[in-house]
């Protein structure tokens, strides 16, 4: 059989090999597509119903004049010369329809380096066959589930037209030091050969690098905190960062009532003021961090380190923020 | 929503003419076949003639051929139905009918118009 | 010609039953069948289109089915506003053909 492409919606002509160009012509074509069960036979005499669909030309010739999806199948022309003499004829039709071009839609203005983030959704509408959608880096295919990449792809039909809606949804890791604006763009290719893809406009979004986060330092003056009743502790929290973080203090795990400040001066220490004692350095764009824990203890005149697990009451005693 | 409306029945006497239109809306007129059928009282339904959306091509069955032609005018939304050589048997309701082809067979009809051929 | 012969011409039933009418084409008319609904002084009503697709606004209890050249009309339960005449139409090729009808009364 001879293949036959057709556009759906274009007339489509198929020529009845052997037949004489005028009547009376002794010929039949018989058709077995999406809307027939079995054979129908057309015939150069037999105008009705189907001429919407296919009718048989004073040439003997078939004419399909807007061919649709239900037009797939294989249409079969017998005739016979004036001499007796009979030609068959076998076709083949496949029928497509080229979608719109494909748009990225809720695409990303930016990414954040080392975690997943959903670049855009490409979609393409009106496609027969249903054809498939790609993404490309900078001009390159990305391949799914390789370095990052992971693709959802959906495929919805149309009830009345049969035309196909392609949705491909992008996510991807963009690696840390990379390209700050890296060109996404989707493809259709056509499920029938000999067609060009179809390409989006590219989209560009800006990479963003979160800034590492350096440890948050707290310094204890005395070192190892332990000191004499009624001596002085300075807790001083360091942070890298800029710009400068709000900083918090807490002690045995409950934040104390207090202004922030990277400085925290326990004067006349009290067994009061004996625990545990940590800062919190707040960035705006990373959210809270914090410390190591230190523990302030008092030593008893003759004791040489920290009292072992003395923890004091919950009263502040006498506190100063510098 | 879509309408047809018929008009131009009435009664006629035996061998003379009348022209039926359909004014028809609320569908994209010239995507459609377009079709008259007739029911005599107290009969069944028959087909009358089909045209298609182009009005390029007619249809009729032996009982009318040659006396009764089926028209349109796209630019109107009209179909129209000239009856010549009317007889006693053309008596009937007259619908005016979306279809008549094999994508849609015939979906939607008219209320219809009486017509009687009577001397 | 294609000849459709329906049957039965006329039948008597009640609310809630089922009812079956049957159209036999004289030869292979594919689906291209419809049905239709008639109520006197009205003009007909598409119920089923291409053998077995029930048309819009139609209530669930009408279906269509086809075997080879048969095709059959089936009302699940019988409603009041159902009695009407039935009529089967061919559109796979000219001349188009209704069956006779159906008149469907009250018992």
């Known amino acids: 059989a001879q293949n036959i492409t057709a556009r759906i919606g274009e007339p489509l002509v198929l020529k009845c090999k052997g037949a004489p160009k005028k009547p009376p012509q002794r010929l039949e074509w018989k058709l077995n597509t999406g809307r027939t069960e079995a054979w129908k036979v057309l015939s150069p005499q037999g105008g009705g119903p189907w001429d919407s669909v296919a009718r048989v030309l004073p040439n003997g010739s078939l004419f399909l004049p807007a061919v649709g999806i239900q037009d797939e199948g294989i249409f079969r022309c017998q005739a016979m010369n004036r001499n007796g003499k009979e030609t068959k004829s076998n076709y083949r039709v496949r029928v497509y329809q080229i979608p719109g071009k494909p748009e990225i839609v809720d695409s990303a203005s930016e990414l954040t380096a080392g975690v997943p983030n959903k670049v855009g959704t490409c979609v393409s509408e009106g496609s027969y066959p249903a054809g498939t959608l790609s993404w490309h880096l900078d001009g390159k295919p990305l391949v799914p589930n390789e370095k990052g990449v992971s693709v959802k792809e959906q495929t919805r039909r149309h009830p009345e037209t049969g035309l196909f809606t392609l949705q491909s949804e992008l996510m991807v890791t963009p690696a840390r030091g990379g390209d700050p604006r890296p060109t996404f763009s989707c493809s259709f290719s056509p499920g029938l050969p000999r067609h060009r893809a179809l390409r989006t406009a590219p989209i560009q979004p800006r990479v963003w690098e979160p800034v590492p986060l350096e440890e948050v330092q707290l310094v204890v003056e005395p070192e190892g905190g332990a000191v004499a009743p009624g001596g002085t502790v300075t807790l001083t929290c360091e942070v890298p960062a800029q710009p400068s973080p709000q900083i918090h203090w807490m002690k045995d795990g409950v934040p104390l009532p207090l202004p922030p400040s990277p400085v925290l001066i326990l004067p006349e220490i009290g067994p009061q003021d004996q625990g545990t004692y940590s800062c919190v350095a707040t960035h705006s764009s990373h959210g809270p961090q914090e410390s190591r824990a230190v523990s302030i203890s008092i030593i008893e005149p003759g004791e040489e380190g920290p009292t072992a697990g003395s923890v004091g009451g919950s009263g502040l005693g006498t506190l100063a923020l510098a | 929503e879509v309408q047809l409306v018929e008009s131009g029945g009435g009664l006629v006497q035996p061998g003379s003419s009348l022209r039926l239109s359909c004014a028809a809306s609320g569908f994209t007129f010239n995507n459609y076949w377009m079709t008259w059928v007739r029911q005599a009282p107290g009969k069944g339904l028959e087909w009358v003639a089909s045209i298609d959306n182009s009005g390029d091509n007619t249809y009729y069955p032996d009982s009318v051929k040659d006396r009764f032609t089926i028209s349109r005018d796209n630019a109107k939304n009209s179909l129209y139905l000239q009856m010549n050589s009317l007889r006693a048997e053309d008596t009937a309701v007259y619908y005016c009918a979306r279809g008549g082809d094999i994508t849609t067979g015939i979906d939607y009809w008219g209320q219809g118009t009486l017509v009687t051929v009577s001397s | 010609d294609i000849q459709m012969t329906q049957s039965p011409s006329s039948l008597s039933a009640s609310v809630g039953d089922r009812v079956t009418i049957t159209c036999r084409a004289s030869?292979?008319?594919?689906?291209?069948v419809n049905w239709f609904q008639q109520k006197p002084g009205k003009a007909p009503r598409r119920l089923i289109y291409r053998a077995t697709n029930l048309a819009d606004g139609v209530p669930s209890r009408f279906s269509g089915s086809r075997s080879g050249t048969d095709f059959t009309l089936t009302i699940s339960s019988l409603q009041p506003e159902d009695f009407a005449t039935y009529y089967c139409l061919e559109f796979d090729e000219h001349p188009l053909t209704f069956g006779g009808g159906t008149k469907v009364e009250i018992k």
């Open positions: 030869q292979d008319v594919g689906i291209y």
